[in-house]
């Protein structure tokens, strides 16, 4: 990648270990709803209830990041390129990939309420 | 407001070495990788390649294997570019520009350019 | 390597005037472009990103376009000051690359 920002954090399971149900890859954005200031950050997390814990890489407008594989992507000092949409690819060896639902990264400009339509970075 | 500030032009003779420097201010520096673009004189624009600056790991365009190498002195929020045993095609003007990652980003900040002459 | 092919090396312009830059790339890049401009004696200036996104402080008269493999950057309403290079880049993948610009000229 650039410069990772990605850092490598250990969670446990959310179903039991010995399960082999396909459960959703759940995506978590923080600030909730992905709506951030200039020059803020963003993490993105990914949570695969599946053991052992799949290798996840992140894409940005369907495209892939490139990152090593890691459930946690973080966005320092984010600007107008980085607003668009997230996701993660949780890739198991016993099955196929499975990607999260897309998240919306957008910037609040000062004076603004919420996500931004329009132009992205300003004119 | 963030800036990317690089040294001086340089006149060297075919066969010696040159480092040009890159101080970035104004934003966390290991946020973000930097590039090096090569522009010679009339020409259009080369990338050279890309340096991680939290990892220091280097990616090289193919053509610029060998006598150019990337560094980083991260304490002073700087990037280098060294270029060994120089030659007449490496004139050229020399620029630093930073993206949050090699792919999926543009060069959004870019420094002043770095003039480097070879000439015996 | 992808290739980006700008076409058009100069093109003759006047003050008020639309002009469409184009830029065509070897390979399907999606989005993954941005154009620059670069004035005499200066470093590029990042324009547009992701295609069509005006990038911050970029008068609206800069529009960008397309996807895929076809792309344009056009600028309405031309003033003195857009007298410049413009390139493409594409950076879907690396090794990066570069359209070898476009010279805006007056007539």
């Known amino acids: 990648m650039g410069s990772s920002h990605h850092h490598h954090h250990h969670s446990s399971g959310l179903v039991p270990r010995g399960s082999h149900m396909l459960e959703e890859v759940q995506l978590v954005v923080e600030p909730e709803g992905g709506a951030v200031a200039p020059g803020g950050t963003v993490t993105l997390t990914c949570e695969v209830p599946a053991q052992p814990s799949p290798q996840i890489h992140w894409m940005k407008d369907g495209v892939p990041l490139p990152l090593p594989p890691s459930p946690v992507l973080i966005l320092p000092e984010i600007g107008p390129q980085d607003q668009g949409t997230y996701s993660c690819v949780a890739t198991h060896s016993s099955h196929g990939p499975q990607e999260s639902r897309a998240v919306s990264i957008s910037i609040i400009e000062p004076g603004e309420e919420g996500p931004t339509a329009g132009s992205v970075g300003g004119s | 407001q963030i800036q990317l500030v690089q040294s001086g032009p340089e006149l060297k003779k075919p066969g010696e070495t040159v480092k040009i420097s890159c101080k970035a201010s104004?934003?966390?520096?290991?946020?973000?990788?930097m590039n090096w673009v090569k522009q010679a004189p009339g020409k259009g624009l080369k990338w050279m390649g890309y340096i991680n600056t939290n990892t220091g790991e280097s990616i090289y365009s193919e053509e610029f294997k060998g006598r150019f190498a990337f560094s980083l002195e991260t304490s002073a929020s700087t990037a280098y570019l060294q270029i060994n045993n120089l030659k007449n095609e490496d004139t050229a003007t020399y620029f630093c520009?930073?993206?949050?990652?090699?792919?999926?980003?543009?060069?959004?900040?870019w420094g002043q350019g770095t003039s480097v002459t070879v000439s015996s | 390597d992808i290739v980006m092919t700008q076409s058009q090396k100069f093109m003759s312009t006047s003050v008020g005037d639309r002009v469409s830059i184009t830029c065509k790339a070897s390979q399907n890049v999606g989005t993954a472009v941005a154009w620059y401009q670069q004035r005499p004696g200066q470093s590029p200036k990042l324009l547009i990103f992701s295609a069509s996104n005006r990038y911050t402080g970029v008068p609206d008269r800069f529009t960008g376009s397309g996807s895929g493999t076809d792309f344009t950057l056009t600028l309405s309403n031309m003033q003195p000051e857009d007298l410049a290079d413009y390139f493409c880049q594409q950076y879907s993948s690396y090794p990066l690359t570069f359209g070898v610009g476009t010279k805006l000229e007056l007539k």
């Open positions: 104004g934003y966390t520096f290991t946020n973000f990788g």
């Open positions: 520009a930073r993206s949050r990652m090699v792919t999926a980003y543009g060069m959004d900040y």
